[in-house]
């Protein structure tokens, strides 16, 4: 123990205490007395900065007295006991309860000892993220929306994306007084490359142990992007049948495939099977441009491919087939 006369009593309390709107919170406050030090506590007092009078008093002989009896309660102080714990419980936290409070011990002979505590009134926000379905506008539009509702203080929203773009964040009063709803939009120029990709909304708030991550899968509606595959420029007479495939990317999905040639309908050796075109063996050279027309809800797009079946000697028996 410290030598006599050097130990001082100390009021211990956190500098800041968080509490949730509508909940109860305890403002902890304790008197730390060195082992050899004698002290007598006659009164505990809680007051709020900027307000005259005390909000809670516990007197050694008279017990507790509260400015708002239904909302305040000394947690541990009891008549007939040593008053070393001034912790005060507050019920039904309101926004206006946020502020600086002083916990004071009247001790003898050391005198009054106090400490200030900042009460933070928090409200835990509810977070949602949703896609904003768009078409190819050619200009920046919101493609995702992230909303943090009813936070106090306002939540902090950031976005993580490999697609480029920029956020547009706004605030509005929440449903409960003193709370804030934060809305953040992720804005970019829509393209077919963006469709199906994801962006992540990160919401940070004092009430969260760790940031909340909400992933949004983007939706961009666009007409079909069409190409034809399956031809390798080496098709010969007398080879096996071959297949051309109409490759289409679109959102929504294609509703129909239509095969034709630049000359009109398909020749007899070409048979359409949905996205595929079956080319049967031919006995004379051909030079035909095939057209695949793909339709979805937003429109139709087509691709062309010119196929030549040549006379040259088939050096391999693999035939016309490129698959």
């Amino acid at each position: 123990w410290p030598p006599p006369g050097t130990g001082d009593i100390i009021v211990q309390a956190p500098t800041q205490v968080p509490g949730f709107l509508g909940d109860s919170v305890t403002l902890p406050c304790y008197l730390q007395v060195p082992g050899m030090e004698e002290t007598h506590v006659s009164q505990l007092t809680w007051s709020r900065h900027g307000e005259s009078g005390s909000m809670a008093v516990f007197h050694q002989t008279q017990g507790p007295n509260y400015s708002e009896p239904k909302r305040l309660e000394f947690v541990a102080a009891r008549l007939g006991t040593e008053l070393r714990d001034a912790s005060l419980r507050m019920f039904g936290l309101r926004v206006e309860d946020e502020g600086n409070y002083t916990c004071l011990f009247v001790t003898f002979p050391q005198g009054s000892r106090s400490v200030d505590i900042w009460l933070r009134v928090l409200a835990k926000p509810q977070n949602t993220a949703e896609v904003q379905k768009v078409q190819l506008t050619g200009k920046p539009v919101p493609v995702a929306r992230c909303v943090s509702t009813g936070g106090r203080p306002p939540a902090h929203i950031t976005w993580h994306s490999d697609l480029g773009g920029m956020p547009n964040t706004s605030q509005a009063p929440g449903f409960l007084s003193g709370t804030v709803t934060v809305t953040s939009l992720w804005i970019l120029v829509p393209s077919s490359q963006v469709d199906g990709k994801s962006v992540t909304c990160k919401v940070e708030h004092e009430s969260f142990e760790k940031p909340q991550l909400l992933t949004v899968n983007l939706t961009v509606y666009y007409p079909p992007e069409v190409s034809i595959s399956g031809y390798d420029n080496n098709w010969y007479l007398s080879q096996n049948e071959a297949t051309l495939t109409c490759d289409a990317r679109s959102n929504p999905e294609p509703t129909g495939y239509n095969w034709s040639t630049t000359m009109g309908p398909l020749p007899p050796f070409a048979v359409a099977q949905g996205a595929q075109l079956l080319i049967r063996p031919v006995d004379k050279p051909i030079n035909t441009t095939f057209i695949c027309n793909v339709t979805n809800a937003l429109g139709a797009r087509q691709a062309e491919l010119t196929v030549q079946v040549k006379e040259g000697p088939p050096s391999e028996p693999s035939g016309m087939s490129s698959n």
Epitope: P3, G5, T6, G7, S42, H59, F108, P109, G111
Partner: antibody, heavy 121, light 109 residues
Framework: QVQLVQSGAEVKKPGASVKVSCKAS????????ISWVRQAPGQGLEWIAW????????NYNQKFTGRVTMTTDTSTSTAYMELRSLRSDDTAVYYC??????????????WGQGTTVTVSS | QAVVTQEPSLTVSPGGTVTLTCRSS?????????ANWVQQKPGQAFRGLIG???NRGPGVPARFSGSLLGDKAALTLSGAQPEDEAEYYC?????????FGGGTKLTVL
């Protein structure tokens, strides 16, 4: 105004007990701390103990533990100090003093006029 | 056992300044010793002047001030008056008891 009025002088034989009273007026007695102090002839002042009038909580100078008892009577706003097993070196003027708060600090604010206790065979 | 030492006597001229000190045998006086100063005029009751090292009691003239001076407690009287002639006692707190100094007889001459 705040006043402490002590009982009159006492002459006691060695081994006897003495009870000195200190009547308070002019303030809320139950919220006060009262110390007892003595001054032997030709000697300095010596603190004996304090009592919190509201609850009777006490703190004694270890030198006097077991021989001294402090009490209060809140109905008459009076503090008492009883000293037992008196010896000749207990001969002294005994004072009660009320501690007052100045800002956040206590001080020996108001004193009684003193009670002379003589221990003699 | 802690011993509190004061100057046995000091003299000050009227209107002058004098500092009374209070030394502790256990080491430096600190705020934890809650230095108190009381005054006793001849034939009168004791009167409290200072509590908690430097806090004047209500009604105590501003010419009295308490402080820590080096390793001692001090009572400074600035602008001494004839009526300040008295015995002054320092009181220190040692964790569980008060200890009085021997007193300083102040003469205003």
């Amino acid at each position: 105004q705040v006043q402490l009025v002590q009982s009159g002088a006492e002459v006691k034989k060695p081994g006897a007990s003495v009870k000195v009273s200190c009547k308070a007026s002019g303030y809320t007695f139950t919220s006060s701390y009262i110390s007892w102090v003595r001054q032997a002839p030709g000697q300095g002042l010596e603190w004996i103990a304090w009592i919190y009038a509201g609850t009777g909580d006490t703190n004694y100078n270890q030198k006097f533990t077991g021989r001294v008892t402090m009490t209060t009577d809140t109905s008459t706003s009076t503090a008492y100090m009883e000293l037992r097993s008196l010896r000749s070196d207990d001969t002294a003027v005994y004072y009660c003093a009320r501690h007052g708060l100045t800002g956040r600090h206590w001080y020996f604010a108001v004193w009684g006029q003193g009670t002379t206790v003589t221990v003699s065979s | 056992q802690a011993v509190v030492t004061q100057e046995p006597s000091l003299t000050v001229s009227p209107g002058g300044t004098v500092t009374l000190t209070c030394r502790s045998s256990t080491g430096a006086v600190t705020t934890s010793n809650i230095a108190n100063w009381v005054q006793q005029k001849p034939g009168q009751a004791f009167r409290g002047l200072i509590g908690g090292t430097n806090n004047r009691g209500p009604g105590v003239p501003a010419r009295f001030s308490g402080s820590l001076l080096g390793d001692k407690a001090a009572l400074t009287l600035s602008g001494a008056q004839p009526e300040d002639e008295a015995e002054y006692y320092c009181i220190l707190w040692y964790s569980n008891k008060f200890v009085f100094g021997g007193g300083t007889k102040l003469t205003v001459l």
